[in-house]
Interface confidence: low
Amino acid sequence: SGVFQLQLQEFINERGVLASGRPCEPGCRTFFRVCLKHFQAVVSPGPCTFGTVSTPVLGTNSFAVRDDSSGGGRNPLQLPFNFTWPGTFSLIIEAWHAPGDDLRPEALPPDALISKIAIQGSLAVGQNWLLDEQTSTLTRLRYSYRVICSDNYYGDNCSRLCKKRNDHFGHYVCQPDGNLSCLPGWTGEYCQQPICLSGCHEQNGYCSKPAECLCRPGWQGRLCNECIPHNGCRHGTCSTPWQCTCDEGWGGLFCDQDLNYCTHHSPCKNGATCSNSGQRSYTCTCRPGYTGVDCELELSECDSNPCRNGGSCKDQEDGYHCLCPPGYYGLHCEHSTLSCADSPCFNGGSCRERNQGANYACECPPNFTGSNCEKKVDRCTSNPCANGGQCLNRGPSRMCRCRPGFTGTYCELHVSDCARNPCAHGGTCHDLENGLMCTCPAGFSGRRCEVRTSIDACASSPCFNRATCYTDLSTDTFVCNCPYGFVGSRCEFPVGLPPSFPW
């Protein structure tokens, strides 16, 4: 679809005559008829297949024709067509004299024709005007012409329809050749496809308008490149949506069970070694000099009051040393050179002779302790409460306030498997991931400390100089009954060579 445009510029008819040679009276009132048709090698009469147009009277005899397009007038003349421009044409321009106001062909005398020109040729679509001048014996006509495409039609033949649009069918303007030029943010042959946010994941993201990135189900993030893990996944990730792959050290369906409490929480203090022992469970192995569930307590070896009979304890780098009072000797001042005759029991303690008077034992009244009943009972000094339990003095007795998860007189039992006190004979129960373990006291063995085993402290023949060895079953220690002429805990000193006591 397009328009053939003809611009009449000047018509010269100096003598004011008709084609017949007869003069016009009073002058030649001139108008034009134009016929546009398909290409003919010899232009002949017949239908104006591409269209016709007529002008009003434009002047008399000789005149210039004003360009009237800006004022909505009829110059240039418009011959619209609704087909593909073939590139060739035939054009007939007739100049007529109008004696009256009626310009219809049937209203004019046949000899009113002033001149007739016919041209034919090739004409490409374009904005440039072709200038032409046709001269006959009596007249001259100067004119120009061109073919342009109608609005929304493009291409060499005005056959390409393109109408700019910005709706859901497309977002484009038209180039001079009729090709689409997408508006910013749109792409595709018909500019229907929005250009998503730069970096938006090709498969997992999409957009309905430019610079947008909407995630498909199971994906998230600004660029839809992060998968959404299973709902409730705590310490896990995904490589595809709705997965929950646990991070190192986590277990359970939703990766919410801590299998590496040691690494995640570092509970052991003072350089202790931490061992994972199940879900949220751990064991601290303390360095020498430390104690407590988390090895948080500094241990003085004298704290357990190892020196008996009023001996004073001195901490040393590799342990401790007991300074014994007169009448006592041994590693813990446990051996006495005294007898009941020396009234060694304090605070109303009653004395009992042992080993035929070689030594004695004090039976202390309530609230007193020590080999000689010399100590008032502080039942908490030995840190009897296990697993971080807090020791509380209650007059003559004591009690342990346990941390959550522990129970028993000394907080020695985990609440779970150890709750039913499975260890016999005072065995200590330990909760393990897959059960429990009993630590048996001296003299007992078996999975639940149910087997009594006698410990013979004399088995190692600790007594010298043919002394008689006795096992004290209450303390699992030995006592040497020295023959005449020898003294000492092992009868190792001959009488007359007294031991060199440190005081």
């Epitope: 069918f169 497309g170 018909y190 229907q192």
Partner: nanobody, 120 residues
């Protein structure tokens, strides 16, 4: 509101024929290409035929070429798909669609579909 309504589906024996119709409303029918695609259960959709706005350009998938014919009646705002020599593998839901442009490029609107079942 753009609407494409398919009809003419049904049960037919192998070797038989059906004629599907697609009645269009809600936009300028003359300006847009109309096509047909089908989707069998568990399979990807398959574009089978399309006709340009002018009716001058038609397209057929290899699987239906020579057996199916597409045509349009611009006066009735209707597109037809004549299906001959039907095979069991033609069983699917058939959808009428338009790209919203004159040429057969993409899909913008589709109908609800009509079931075609070819028994052996």
């Amino acid at each position: 509101e753009v609407q494409l309504v398919e009809s003419g589906g049904g049960l037919v024996q192998a070797g038989g024929s059906l004629r599907l119709s697609c009645a269009v409303s809600g936009f300028s029918f003359d300006d847009y290409a109309i096509g047909w695609f089908r989707q069998a259960p568990g399979k990807e959709p398959e574009g089978i035929s399309c006709i340009s706005s002018s009716g001058g350009i038609t397209y057929y998938a290899d699987s239906v070429k020579g057996r199916f014919t597409i045509s349009r009646d611009n006066a009735k705002n209707t597109v037809y798909l004549q299906m001959n020599s039907l095979k069991p593998e033609d069983t699917a839901v058939y959808y009428c669609a338009t790209p919203g442009i004159a040429a057969c490029r993409g899909i913008h609107y589709t109908g609800q579909g009509t079931q075609v079942t070819v028994s052996s």
